[in-house]
């Protein structure tokens, strides 16, 4: 059988390396070997390239070396497949090397902002030795923040008589690390060189790009004073690298500036301790260039109705997100502020804050929670300089069995009944929420008997017991990963009844 | 046997066409560039023009440039030569001869030189501009 | 275009004496690209050396060729009767090919 015709001949010119080309069908099932003609010198010279040895048949690709390799020009390649049955030519095909040269990439040596102008990197680079001296050079440069992992990518070209192998980069973050990396390829050729090696680079810092701002509010002690726990953080947005010296505060009763208070400080919350009224708060942070804009807060009168707009709330799981959803019969709210922390029996550890807008949902990344704790999770609607009331509802990310059962005890031990009582889990030991408890209970040498109640119950009378009987019991605690049995206890039925 | 035979000569006026033809036979034609040389009797050669194996032009004698066209029919194993605007001093026996193939001259590994040469030459075909 | 100069025009010798002929081309010409054939009255030209010093197939070893550059020589070293004939060079290095005028050696 005849080969197969070579077909999809596919070439590239390394550029002042070989002249290399690809065929179809890469095997062949009898032996073939391959013979490539070419002309080059605008066809005035003739050559070929052949896998006609024992280490090359059935390669479907070969190479012309210097010093035949000329530039600029037009070969005319054909490969012939042979094997011991015959020849198959394959269509002759043109190529023009300035459209299929590929160059070494260049080499960027320095990305540097450049003083007193804002948000730009200015990138500079070796032109590859191994390109024409005399051709454009088109550059693909692709930049993206450190901690990114999607790439930008911005065109351009650079004559030869350019020399200056520099490019501005603007329209970045101030105070940001950038990674760069660039590739480039004759202007008219359709092969890219490959990317350079990656060189990082930092705008200049500017004052701080501002700051979000929320609050906590307390009940008021026993003097009226309301404890005020402000606490912000860098606006989103805001440089990675952006660190500020410090903080000033200043806040007053509503139309009553002659009682403005300030205050500095380094931290990132604050308590203040406020009367009965409408107070307005301003925050802003500072560096050795500047301040950040304003950041406002208006914490409402202590009898003050807030509005309420959420009518439900659902949290639920995706594979790597915590989602929330909410509804709220007002359109105009577009902000909403949501606060999560980890529902402990003591006081809260963490408490985190994040806002929302021009959306109803908000998601978190599930590995930025911790599996079995329940977390409670408030979303608050914010209409301007106004806070809505919050709705609230609890999440786990990974729920678990719990770490410990009910402690348990029987009581009112009659003739043929008992009741027992259970107290609560902890919290800290549920590692789920509980759906139900079962209580298993069985007679010395009898059949076991269980009963599941939901898990608002806490006590449970047992009936139709025998009477002078011992019985040994314990209370499953369940939640959607599987149960945890309480201690066991034992009791033993009476045999008269006592009134 | 490996033959050229040439064809098409004859005798016309300054101004005047002819188109000249080569029949190849013995060898694998579109393997071979070939080329058109003449001779005046008692004159040394000159080489007029030649076509490489894919049909691409190699190329004319700068006395013949723009009047003489080379081309070639691998499916009838034929080489052409169109002559026009004849003048005096193209009268001469025009030979066809086969370039050197694609072989040989291997310089290692898988890549071979083509070595140039006219390895195998037809007997002639006479053309004379005369008025 | 390459002007290929032969010398001497003609080399008159005697059976079994070297003759020695001369290429000298008007500019470099890689030495790949660099022919010589021979001619006798009324024959086609026949090949002797290609790539300046490769005898063609068929061609005795009195025949030899070298050079590089812009000169290049065709030596036999014992002419017989057969050698003596036109003998001429020609360059494929650029276009247009070009052959020398040719040397004519004949018997003294």
């Known amino acids: 059988v005849l080969p197969a015709k070579p077909e999809n001949i596919s070439c590239i010119f390394y550029y002042e390396e070989n002249f290399t080309c690809t065929w179809s069908p890469e095997k062949e099932a009898s032996y073939t070997w391959y013979k490539v003609k070419r002309t080059y010198s605008y066809g005035y010279k003739s050559d070929i390239c052949s896998t006609d040895n024992s280490t090359r048949g059935n390669h479907a690709s070969c190479s012309f070396l210097p010093p035949t390799i000329t530039n600029p020009d037009n070969y005319t390649i054909q490969v012939e497949a042979q094997n011991a049955d015959g020849i198959m030519k394959s269509d002759i095909t043109y190529w023009n090397l300035d459209a299929i040269m590929k160059i070494e990439p260049p080499e960027i040596f320095s990305v540097k902002s450049v003083l007193g102008i804002k948000r730009m990197l200015q990138i500079k680079w070796i032109r590859p030795v191994l390109a024409p001296h005399s051709s454009t050079l088109k550059y693909t440069l692709r930049f993206r923040t450190i901690n990114s992992a999607y790439w930008m990518e911005v065109n351009f070209t650079k004559e030869d008589i350019d020399r200056d192998e520099t490019y501005n980069l603007t329209e970045l973050q101030a105070f940001t690390e950038y990674v760069m990396t660039l590739r480039c390829a004759p202007a008219e050729s359709m092969f890219w060189s490959g990317w350079s090696q990656e060189k990082v680079g930092t705008t200049e810092e500017e004052a701080p790009y501002g700051l979000d701002l929320w609050r906590v509010l307390k009940p008021a002690m026993v003097d009226g004073r309301r404890p005020v726990q402000l606490m912000w953080k860098k606006a989103t947005g805001a440089p990675v690298l952006e660190k500020a010296l410090g903080y000033n505060i200043w806040y007053f009763p509503e139309n009553n500036t002659n009682l403005t208070e300030t205050v500095n400080t380094t931290n990132q919350t604050h308590e203040l301790y406020l009367g009965g009224k409408t107070y307005w708060v301003y925050v802003v942070s500072y560096n050795s260039l500047g301040e950040s804009p304003v950041a406002t807060l208006r914490i409402p009168a202590l009898n003050e109705k807030t509005f309420q707009c959420i009518e439900a709330m659902q949290a639920c799981l995706t594979q790597d997100q915590l989602v929330v959803e909410w509804q709220s019969s007002a359109p105009e709210v577009d902000t909403w502020m949501v606060e999560w922390f980890p529902d402990v029996d003591s006081e809260p550890s963490s408490f985190s804050w994040e806002s929302v807008s021009q959306a109803r949902n908000w998601t978190i990344q599930k590995d930025e929670l911790k599996p079995l704790w329940c977390y409670n999770i408030s979303v608050y609607p914010v209409l301007r300089d106004r806070v809505g009331q919050p709705y609230s509802t609890q999440a786990y990310v990974q729920e678990g069995i719990p770490s410990a059962g009910p402690v348990t005890q029987a009581d009112s031990i009659g003739v043929k009944t008992v009741t027992i009582t259970w107290k609560e889990i902890p919290k800290s030991k549920r590692n789920g929420f509980i759906k139900n408890y079962t209580i298993f209970y069985q007679a010395e040498d009898g059949k076991e008997f269980s009963k599941t109640v939901n898990s608002n119950i806490l006590q449970y009378r047992l009936e139709s017991l025998t009477r002078r009987t011992s019985y040994s019991l314990q209370v499953m605690a369940s939640t959607n990963a599987g149960g945890t049995n309480g201690t066991k206890i034992n009791f033993k039925t009476l045999s008269i009844s006592v009134l | 046997e490996v033959q050229l035979v040439e064809s098409g000569g004859g005798v016309v006026r300054p101004g005047g066409s002819l188109r000249l033809s080569c029949a190849a036979s013995?060898?694998?034609?579109?393997?071979?560039?070939m080329s058109w040389v003449r001779q005046i009797p008692g004159r040394g050669l000159e080489w007029v023009s030649g076509?490489?194996?894919?049909?691409?032009?190699?190329g004319y004698a700068d006395s013949v440039k723009g009047r003489f066209t080379v081309s070639r029919d691998d499916a009838n194993n034929s080489l052409y030569l169109q002559m026009n605007s004849l003048r005096a001093e193209d009268t001469a026996l025009y030979l066809c001869a086969r370039e050197s193939p694609l072989r040989l001259g291997d310089l290692g590994g898988d890549y071979f030189y083509y070595y140039y040469y006219m390895d195998v030459w037809g007997k002639g075909t006479t053309v004379t501009v005369s008025s | 275009e390459i002007v290929l100069t032969q010398s001497p025009g003609t080399l008159s010798l005697s059976p079994g004496e070297r003759a020695t002929l001369s290429c000298r081309a008007s500019q470099s010409v890689s030495s790949r690209y660099l022919v010589w054939y021979q001619q006798k009255p009324g024959q086609a030209p026949r090949l002797l050396i290609y790539g300046t010093s490769s005898r063609a197939t068929g061609i005795p070893d009195r025949f030899s060729g070298s050079g590089s550059g812009t000169d290049f020589t065709l030596t036999i070293s014992r002419l017989e009767p057969e050698d003596f004939a036109v003998y001429y060079c020609?360059?494929?290095?650029?276009?247009?090919?070009?052959f020398g005028q040719g040397t004519k050696v004949e018997i003294k």
């Open positions: 013995g060898f694998t034609f579109d393997d071979y560039g």
């Open positions: 020609q360059q494929y290095d650029n276009s247009p090919r070009t």
């Open positions: 076509i490489n194996w894919a049909g691409g032009t190699i």
